[in-house]
Interface confidence: low
């Protein structure tokens, strides 16, 4: 990989746990200023594999609320608006980073955590297992 | 909201920037142990709105590598395996948290950042605008 020279203005790293424990500024910088203006908020309803969104709340986590997608049907919606069970609605999952308060209930001490969330659903051709 | 009593064993928060700056343990805890064993890695190919995955690398970001989905077609794949342009393949986007080194090139100082990533694609019915 590329070796980047260390910035001489970095904070002191005398912490005995360094480099496991780092300082993080929670003032979130949002890099999404140039996002596509096309509204994607209604894809959950217009998709051939539509989904509902469920609220997952955990006050010990940052962010404390995450919305999870759950596919509405096992099959996919066909051109007639009916569920076609020859196809499958499946969740698209992504691993995301969150901060977990550690020790619990501490306002300024966290641990990084990876969680798997379902972001939406897609329609796939099923894998058919033929019995010999 | 729920008020949770502060844990008396919390680290000291005398930092003048508190509560904006917090301590974070980078030893990632992975909560995905009970994930569904069904592999979703091939959905990108089996979907009626298939996608390709592109590598986005940034050594100043944690995680440094993020995979971005790009829909292969404007339309969706029909039962005959052809692209049907009466439907649209659209990206499902998710806002995720990442850590950005701040000041740059510092190993132990970060800022939280929100970025928008495309996780996969779904097939939607297009919005048709009728001209009067």
């Amino acid at each position: 990989g590329i070796t980047i020279p260390r910035n001489p203005g970095c904070p002191n790293s005398e912490d005995k746990n360094f480099p496991r424990t780092v300082m993080v500024n929670l003032n979130i910088h949002n890099r999404n200023t140039n996002t596509n203006p096309k509204r994607s908020s209604d894809y959950y309803n217009r998709s051939t594999s539509p989904w509902n969104l469920h609220r997952n709340e955990d006050p010990e986590r940052y962010p404390s609320v995450i919305w999870e997608a759950k596919c509405r049907h096992l099959g996919c919606i066909n051109a007639d608006g009916n569920v076609d069970y020859h196809m499958n609605s499946v969740p698209i999952q992504q691993e995301i980073l969150v901060l977990r308060r550690e020790p619990p209930h501490c306002p300024n001490s966290f641990r990084l955590e990876k969680i798997l969330v379902s972001v939406g659903c897609t329609c796939v051709t099923p894998i058919v297992h033929h019995v010999a | 909201g729920i008020t949770i009593p502060r844990n008396p064993g919390c680290p000291n928060s005398e930092d003048k920037n508190f509560p904006r700056t917090v301590m974070v343990n980078l030893n990632i805890h992975n909560r995905n142990t009970n994930t569904n064993p069904k592999r979703s890695s091939d959905y990108y190919n089996r979907s009626t709105s298939p996608w390709n995955l592109h590598r986005n690398e940034d050594p100043e970001r944690y995680p440094s590598v993020i995979w971005e989905a790009k829909c292969r077609h404007l339309g969706c794949i029909n039962a005959d395996g052809n692209v049907d342009y009466h439907m649209n393949s659209v990206p499902i986007q998710q806002e995720i948290l990442v850590l950005r080194r701040e000041p740059p090139h510092c190993p132990n100082s970060f800022r939280l950042e929100k970025i928008l990533v495309s996780v996969g694609c779904t097939c939607v019915t297009p919005i048709v605008h009728h001209v009067a």
Partner: nanobody, 119 residues
Framework: EVQLVESGGGLVQPGGSLRLSCAAS????????MYWVRQAPGKGLEWVAE????????YYVDSVKGRFTISRDNAKNSLYLQMNGLRAEDTAVYYC????????????WGQGTLVTVSS
């Protein structure tokens, strides 16, 4: 810090009316589209209404068209939802939300206000 605080929910009889309010702070309210979103007990999330930055355009889900009206007062950093002709199926927690809605982190959402329609 972005804050969205809803109020105005409550118990109302079928056919009745309620006006929900959302007080916004921590961001430039007039720069964002705003939304009302609801979640019925045991159900998924449903987008109810959207209003553009200057209030010139409003959009509604079919089930509330002609009954609900979304409005905003940029001078007061406030969003409103006037609900008339309420039905049992309108029972839900109503959230106000900021900006482009993606089912993501909760930076964009309020804590919600419960609307119960029952005789």
């Amino acid at each position: 810090e972005v804050q969205l605080v809803e109020s105005g929910g409550g118990l109302v009889q079928p056919g009745g009316s309620l006006r929900l309010s959302c007080a916004a702070s921590g961001f430039t309210f007039s720069s964002y589209s705003m939304y009302w979103v609801r979640q019925a007990p045991g159900k998924g999330l449903e987008w109810v209404a959207e209003i553009k930055q200057d209030g010139s355009e409003q959009y509604y889900v079919d089930s509330v068209k002609g009954r609900f009206t979304i409005s905003r007062d940029n001078a007061k950093n406030s969003l409103y939802l006037q609900m008339n002709g309420l039905r049992a199926e309108d029972t839900a927690v109503y959230y106000c939300a900021k900006g482009e809605i993606l089912p993501l982190y909760f930076d964009y959402w309020g804590q919600g206000t419960l609307v119960t329609v029952s005789s």
